[in-house]
């Protein structure tokens, strides 16, 4: 059996982990709540350093953050699989690691969007990562809530596969999105969304060159590279995919 | 400065306990509960290995499998010191016990540590 949290005071609800933690959403339950750099050790996984960020709604775990432009995220398969980036600063975690803080279980999915005049947009998935076999497929398992899920991601219970300029898996027969645009992501038809694109600072004339930004079609529109993004996760309690 | 000074080795037999201290001083460690703490050790000719380690708030004690069961990490924030309870210690214990502290939340890894204390010996001989 696998190792749990042991209580110490039941009165309070406290308990106490003898072990690294296998994700932040373990941290936060055991009373850790002060977001920052930890070393977790999913099940059957050598440890490694997460950026945990407590909220609310529990610990999640940063898997994705650009705001300077200051790491290159156009870069092949095993450096997406593996990870690449400062943890303090822009960072990819790894879908690896991902996928092994997920395991087989739903996922709630936040990603955080800022434009250059200031306006945040949140918004919430839940979805199943596949591992390597599946070159990561993404499904989502339920609707999206809100205005902007319906054009932004592939309708519920389809898979899109990870794609990197050197692993051309997206949905297109015609082109490799990864190749055509920048960085690795789950490209379906390429038009979407890309939040490991080419980070701007300013917005350059030439559309051919504007489409490899980092864009999230149905928040400010395909041609719009966006100033900082986040993308959090946080797998969901026991149930395990479908 | 920060400092990190660690006290309670010795000479123990085979089955024997020993309590291992840690002081933290310096105007860093006035917050000395934003601070992770761990214990390594170092056997002769060996490298440095990882014992246990507790988070700022306490509730996260990771231990090395070596270790589980027989030694226990805890932290008195308030008085600035770490502690390393010790018990059936066995032969293969013996080594120069180190007190660190990490800015990371919780680790396991030597390299996750940026404060070191100059070590205790423990040394466990019938």
């Known amino acids: 059996l696998p190792e749990m949290a042991q209580p110490v005071d039941p009165a309070h609800n406290v308990s106490r982990l003898h072990r690294l933690p296998r994700d932040c959403q373990e941290l936060f339950q055991v009373g850790e709540r002060q977001s920052g750099l930890f070393e977790i050790q999913p099940q059957g996984s050598p440890p490694f350093l997460v950026n945990c960020k407590m909220t609310s709604d529990g610990g999640w775990t940063v898997i994705q953050r650009r705001h300077d432009g200051s790491v290159d995220f156009n870069r092949p398969w095993e450096a997406y699989k593996a990870g690449f980036g400062d943890p303090h600063g822009e960072f990819w975690l790894g879908l690896e690691k991902v996928h092994s803080i997920t395991g087989d279980r739903n996922s709630r999915l936040a990603v955080q969007l800022r434009d250059w005049d200031g306006n945040a947009e949140l918004l919430q998935f839940s979805v199943h990562l596949g591992g390597e076999d599946t070159a990561y497929s993404l499904q989502l398992t339920a609707p999206v809530a809100g205005q902007l899920g319906a054009t932004t991601v592939p309708p519920s219970g389809l898979s899109v596969p990870f794609s990197t300029w050197d692993q051309d898996h997206d949905l297109r027969r015609d082109k490799n999105c990864a190749k055509s645009l920048s960085g690795g992501w789950w490209f379906g038809t390429c038009s979407h969304s890309n939040l490991n694109g080419q980070y701007f600072r300013s917005i350059p004339q030439q559309r051919q060159k504007l489409k490899k930004g980092i864009f999230w079609k149905t928040w400010r529109g395909r041609y719009y590279p966006l100033q900082a993004t986040t993308m959090l996760i946080q797998p969901m309690a026991a149930e395990a995919a479908s | 400065e920060v400092q990190l000074v660690e006290s309670g080795g010795g000479l123990v037999q085979p089955g024997g306990s020993l309590r291992l201290s840690c002081a933290a001083s310096?105007?860093?460690?006035?917050?000395?509960?934003?601070?992770?703490m761990g214990w390594f050790r170092q056997a002769p000719g060996k490298e440095r290995e990882f014992v246990a380690a507790?988070?700022?708030?306490?509730?996260?004690?990771p231990y090395a499998d070596s270790v589980k069961g027989r030694f226990a990490i805890s932290r008195d924030n308030a008085k600035n010191t770490l502690t390393l309870q010790m018990n059936s210690l066995k032969p293969e214990d013996t080594a120069v016990y180190y007190c660190?502290?990490?800015?990371?939340?919780?680790?396991?890894?030597?390299?996750?540590?940026?404060?070191w204390g100059q070590g205790t010996q423990v040394t466990v001989s019938s």
């Open positions: 310096g105007r860093t460690f006035s917050t000395f509960n934003t601070y992770s």
């Open positions: 660190a502290a990490s800015k990371i939340g919780i680790a396991s890894t030597i390299r996750y540590y940026d404060y």
């Open positions: 507790i988070s700022r708030s306490g509730n996260v004690t």
